[in-house]
C-alpha cells in the first residue's frame, strides 16, 4: 500500500498522527470496529502531551480509548506495552467493578470528565477517538 502523508478530511493532525473525534456514542467493540474500517485504531495514549491533546478535543465527556482487559491483562489495541507505557487512571481505578448490575465486571477504558481514565462496562455507548499514524502504509491500493 501507499504511505499516508496527510490526514483524511475531518481528521486532526498532531505529532505525526491523525485523530478523528466522534460526536455520537457506540459500545467499545463497535467503536473499535469503526476505527478499523477507517484503517485506524482506537486512540492509544503514549504521553502526557498526547493525553492533553485528546482531552482538549473531547471536553469533559466519557470517551472510549484503545485499552481493554477483556482477555485478562490490560492491552493497547496497537500492541503498545501497557506495563511500561503511559498511564493516567483516576484514583482507585481500574477497579473491575461488578456492582453495576449489567453482568460481569469492567473491561474497557475511557476518558472521564477530568481526562483521567476509568474502566467501565464495554457495552456502554460512549463517544470514541480513532487514531492512525502518518507515514504508515495504508491498506488502499495505490492509484495507477
Amino acid at each position: 500500500g501507499s504511505e499516508r502523508t496527510c490526514c483524511p478530511v475531518n481528521w486532526v493532525e498532531h505529532e505525526r498522527s491523525c485523530y478523528w473525534f466522534s460526536r455520537s456514542g457506540k459500545a467499545w467493540a463497535d467503536a473499535d470496529n469503526y476505527c478499523r474500517l477507517e484503517d485506524a485504531h482506537l486512540v492509544v495514549v503514549t504521553s502526557w502531551e498526547e493525553q492533553k491533546f485528546v482531552q482538549h478535543h473531547i471536553g469533559p465527556v466519557n470517551t472510549w480509548m484503545g485499552l481493554h482487559d477483556q482477555n485478562g491483562p490490560w492491552k493497547w489495541v496497537d500492541g503498545t506495552d501497557y506495563e511500561t507505557g503511559f498511564k493516567n487512571w483516576r484514583p482507585e481505578q481500574p477497579d473491575d467493578w461488578y456492582g453495576h448490575g449489567l453482568g460481569g465486571g469492567e473491561d474497557c477504558a475511557h476518558f472521564t470528565d477530568d481526562g483521567r481514565w476509568n474502566d467501565d462496562v464495554c457495552q456502554r455507548p460512549y463517544r470514541w477517538v480513532c487514531e492512525t499514524e502518518l507515514d504508515k502504509a495504508s491498506q488502499e491500493p495505490p492509484l495507477l
Epitope: W48, K52, Q55, K87, D113, G115
Partner: antibody, heavy 119, light 107 residues
Framework: QVQLVESGGGVVQPGRSLRLSCAAS????????MHWVRQAPGQGLEWMAI????????YYADSVKGRFTISRDNSKNTLYLQINSLRAEDTAVYYC????????????WGQGTLVTVSS | DIQMTQSPSSLSAYVGDRVTITCRAS??????LNWYQQKPGKAPKVLIY???SLQSGVPSRFSGSGSGTDFTLTISSLQPEDFATYYC?????????FGPGTKVDIK
C-alpha cells in the same frame, strides 16, 4: 477549606542539602497531583516539579533535573522537595500548590517558605 | 521547552480603566493557558484557567480569551485591589512555564 503549609526553609550553605515539606489539609490529598514553584527575590515565578496523586509520575524543570527530588507521603498528607548541592541561585521562596486534574493549573497555593543559600 | 512571553512588562492605569495583557506561547498549547495574580509578599492565586474559565470567587471583571498561541487577559474596569503582578502559564507540556509577568500599578 484547602490549606497548604510549607516548612523547612532557612539559611543554608552552598553545597548542602535541604528538604522542604508541604502539609496539606481540607481536601483528599491522595487524589491530587502537587506542584512546587519557586520565586527568586524580585523575580518571576519558576515552575519546578509535579508529582501525580499516587507518586507514579514525576516531571521536573530541566534546570533542576537530577538535583531536586519531589516525593509525597499520602499517609501523612505531606509533599516534599529534596534539594541537593544547593547553589546561590536556588535562593527563593518555594511554594507548593495543588494541581487541578483536568487542566494542571495550580488552583491552591501555600504561603511559601524562604530558602537562602549563603556562606 | 515552551517559551511564554507577556506584554507589556508593566503598565500604569487609572481606577476604572480597561486593561489588556497579552501572552504568547512559542508553540500551540491548545486550551492549557492559566492566569495568576500576585500581590507583594503574597502567594499567587489563580484567576483564570483553561483560557477563559473564571476560578470560583474571582470577580467577573476579569476575562480571558485566545487560542493556540495567543492569549489575552482583560480587566474590564480596574479596581484598587487589582494593582498587582499578573502571570500567564502554560500547562500543556512539562516544564509548565510561566510568562515573565506584567506589573499593573496606579497612574
Amino acid at each position: 477549606q484547602v490549606q497548604l503549609v510549607e516548612s523547612g526553609g532557612g539559611v543554608v550553605q552552598p553545597g548542602r542539602s535541604l528538604r522542604l515539606s508541604c502539609a496539606a489539609s481540607g481536601f483528599t490529598f491522595s487524589s491530587y497531583g502537587m506542584h512546587w514553584v519557586r520565586q527568586a527575590p524580585g523575580q518571576g515565578l519558576e515552575w519546578m516539579a509535579i508529582i501525580w496523586y499516587d507518586g507514579s509520575n514525576k516531571y521536573y524543570a530541566d534546570s533542576v533535573k537530577g538535583r531536586f527530588t519531589i516525593s509525597r507521603d499520602n499517609s501523612k498528607n505531606t509533599l516534599y522537595l529534596q534539594i541537593n548541592s544547593l547553589r546561590a541561585e536556588d535562593t527563593a521562596v518555594y511554594y507548593c500548590a495543588r494541581e487541578d486534574p483536568r487542566t494542571s493549573c495550580s488552583d491552591y497555593w501555600g504561603q511559601g517558605t524562604l530558602v537562602t543559600v549563603s556562606s | 521547552d515552551i517559551q511564554m512571553t507577556q506584554s507589556p512588562s508593566s503598565l500604569s492605569a487609572y481606577v476604572g480603566d480597561r486593561v489588556t495583557i497579552t501572552c504568547r506561547a512559542s508553540q500551540n498549547i491548545f486550551s492549557y493557558l492559566n492566569w495568576y495574580q500576585q500581590k507583594p509578599g503574597k502567594a499567587p492565586k489563580v484567576l483564570i484557567y483553561a483560557v477563559f474559565s473564571l476560578q470560583s470567587g474571582v470577580p467577573s471583571r476579569f476575562s480571558g480569551s485566545g487560542s493556540g498561541t495567543d492569549f489575552t487577559l482583560t480587566i474590564s474596569s480596574l479596581q484598587p485591589e487589582d494593582f498587582a503582578t499578573y502571570y500567564c502559564q502554560q500547562s500543556y507540556s512539562t516544564p509548565f512555564t510561566f510568562g515573565p509577568g506584567t506589573k499593573v500599578d496606579i497612574k
